[in-house]
Interface confidence: medium
């Protein structure tokens, strides 16, 4: 069942033009989800065995970062990888973790994008594709901003979009990125994409919005059947989480309810993630979905920042990127007040909607992400929404 | 302009059946889901039940899951709500709004009394 | 299927700002970003003005606005107008068994 995804309200985004792209989003007061729920269990997580395969699966390599893989698995069979929670501690996960050049055979560039003041939203996916429009523009800081996405220096051109068929889109973040669908001080001007149509379905094809200039060199249309217009007359947020629901083939049983203390579910169900995605509610069997952070160990230090990655204290040298000063941490941890902190410890919500943050060796912060009941959600940080409706 | 438009709703003793419709116009009808929300007198709303755009999909509250049945026809644009084994709780305004979630439009609502 | 917590009545005097909570739990407010609330005047339907905690559709005036911490939703009203005196109930995306859940509704008096 092909499911749907959008990141919290967000469907499409807009890049305005003439303003700084390394600054923090203004205006904007949504906070992050919190950190897990105290008492769910973040003891290490088993993945099955198997080889990582089809488009759910995609490895892709981080453009900016040469040489160095990031894992974006949906179902990762991640064999062995050491992973350490939340609290830094390290946690042995069984076996080795493959490069993604060594599974794919080769390694998977991002297209370049042209700049564009507007980024349309992508169209409706084909049965079996997952649609990630634009990721939530993350709130805590451009440090975090520029160690998620694993780039040496921003890219103030725009969105960018990572291998095709994932079909992920991925802008930049910009301090004036806005949602298209959210039409508060647009004045009519905005252009959103009504990604209402549920997948599969057959798209109308009134008021197609402008696309021109903003399709990369390989089309949009090569990855999903259409594009699905945006209605002009409906001014209010348009976004897929709300839109629709996802189909299912069975009705929902009875799941059990919030316990007290209202904790998320048990979190030894989500031990063993299964290979099946979206399962609907209430057919107990959670799963998760792991998304690594790009590798930061060769970033150096941190624009505007007095945050410079270092090697995690008592561990001089490891995991070092050559570099002249040697001030640079391991993955997934980031020099703060003059030492080396876990982005998990230093963003407590640095993954949203309760996922839980993990570093992997020489991979970096990962997130494992909730996908249980009505939606679930996936991506680098979990800022991915999708409705098992 | 987004509009929805409820009907079928009236006086019923205890134990009976309503059909209540919701006639939408103004959007791409079965591109959305539709939900069907209540509010018994001087309460406050109560999501009852949610379909998907294609109808393949329907999920309800406990209080009226087994008596209550969603329904849609896209070629009609028509939103339904069939109540059986009605009881005096069921008494309220219930309103058709689009989406499951976020409900950006909404119905100006159908009373039903369920009284003997 | 316990609502969300609101307190049943708020009152203010025009030109004063105005805060209503909404309390739920790790399950519902705290967890998720899925917050939204809805004026209703009496008679009437409900009408969306704060959706995803903190945003405001097209048209809604931007004396309103939302903000989230831990377990608990706020929507604040600033300069506070006759016209405000309605109905405001918070919904929140919920996991387990009922994806929407509702608030009981907090009564605005206009001074």
């Known amino acids: 069942v092909p499911a749907r995804e959008a990141g919290s309200a967000v469907e499409a985004e807009e890049l305005v033009k003439g303003s700084p792209a390394w600054e923090p989003p203004a205006n904007d007061t949504r906070e992050e989800a919190g950190p897990p729920a105290a008492g769910e269990d973040e003891a290490s997580w088993t993945a099955p065995g198997g080889e990582l395969a089809g488009p759910e699966e995609v490895l892709q390599e981080s453009a900016a970062v040469t040489g160095t893989a990031w894992l974006e698995a949906d179902s990762p069979g991640l064999g062995g990888v050491t992973a350490e929670a939340g609290s830094g501690d390290a946690q042995a996960l069984p076996a080795t973790l493959q490069a993604p050049h060594e599974v794919l055979g080769q390694s998977i560039m991002p297209p370049a994008i042209p700049e564009a003041t507007e980024a349309s939203g992508p169209p409706s996916p084909t049965p079996g594709d997952k649609l990630s429009p634009a990721s939530e523009l993350p709130k805590e800081s451009p440090l975090e901003v520029w160690l998620n996405l694993g780039g040496s220096t921003p890219d103030p051109q725009g969105p960018e979009l990572t291998y095709p068929f994932q079909g992920t889109l991925e802008p930049q973040p910009a301090s004036d990125i806005i949602d298209i669908d959210y039409f508060e001080g647009l004045d009519g001007e905005g252009r959103g994409a009504d990604l209402g149509s549920f997948p599969g379905s057959p798209g109308t094809s009134e008021n197609h919005p402008d696309t021109e200039g903003e399709t990369p060199s390989w089309s949009l249309l090569d990855l999903y059947d259409d594009f699905t217009p945006f209605d002009e007359s409906d001014f209010y947020p348009t976004t897929s989480f709300y839109d629709d629901l996802d189909e299912e083939e069975e009705e929902e049983e009875d799941d059990k309810d919030a316990v007290g203390g209202g904790d998320l579910e048990d979190e030894n169900e989500l031990l063993v993630p299964t290979g099946k995605p979206g399962l609907g509610p209430g057919t107990g069997q959670p799963t998760s979905r792991w998304h690594a952070v790009p590798p930061q160990h060769t970033l150096g230090s941190v624009p505007g920042s007095s945050i410079a990655l270092r090697p995690r204290p008592g561990e001089p040298g490891r995991d070092l990127a050559s570099s002249e000063n040697g001030t640079e941490c391991r993955s997934g941890f980031v020099r703060h007040n003059g030492s080396c902190r876990s982005v998990c410890d230093l963003f407590p919500s640095y993954c949203h909607n309760g996922g839980q943050c993990y570093l992997v060796e020489n991979i970096g912060a990962f997130c494992r992400c909730n996908t249980q009941d009505y939606i679930w959600h996936k991506g680098m940080r979990c800022e991915s929404i999708i409705t098992d409706f | 302009e987004v509009q929805l438009l409820e009907s079928g709703g009236g006086l019923v003793q205890p134990g009976g059946s309503l059909r209540l419709s919701c006639a939408a116009s103004?959007?791409?009808?079965?591109?959305?889901?539709m939900s069907w929300v209540r509010q018994a007198p001087g309460k406050g709303l109560e999501w009852v039940s949610a379909?998907?755009?294609?109808?393949?999909?329907?999920y309800y509250a406990d209080s009226v899951k087994g008596r209550f049945t969603i329904s849609r026809d896209n070629s009609k644009n028509t939103l339904y709500l069939q109540m059986n084994s009605l009881r005096a709780e069921d008494t309220a305004v219930y309103y058709c709004?689009?989406?499951?979630?976020?409900?950006?439009?909404w119905g100006q609502g159908t009373l039903v009394t369920v009284s003997s | 299927q316990s609502a969300l917590t609101q307190p049943a009545s708020v009152s203010g005097s025009p030109g004063q700002s105005i805060t209503i909570s909404c309390t739920g739990t790790s399950t519902d407010v705290n967890g998720y970003n899925y917050v939204s609330w809805y004026q209703q005047y009496a008679g009437k339907a409900p009408k969306l003005i704060i959706f995803?905690?903190?945003k405001r559709p097209s048209g809604v005036s931007n004396r309103f606005s939302g903000s989230k911490s831990g377990d608990t939703a706020s929507l604040t009203i600033s300069g506070l107008q006759a016209e405000d005196e309605a109905d405001y109930h918070c919904s929140s995306y919920r996991r387990l068994r009922l994806p929407v859940l509702f608030g009981g509704g907090t009564k605005l008096t206009v001074l």
């Open positions: 379909i998907s755009g294609s109808g393949g999909s329907t």
């Open positions: 709004a689009k989406k499951w979630n976020l409900f950006d439009y």
């Open positions: 995803d905690v903190s």
């Open positions: 103004g959007f791409t009808f079965s591109s959305y889901a």
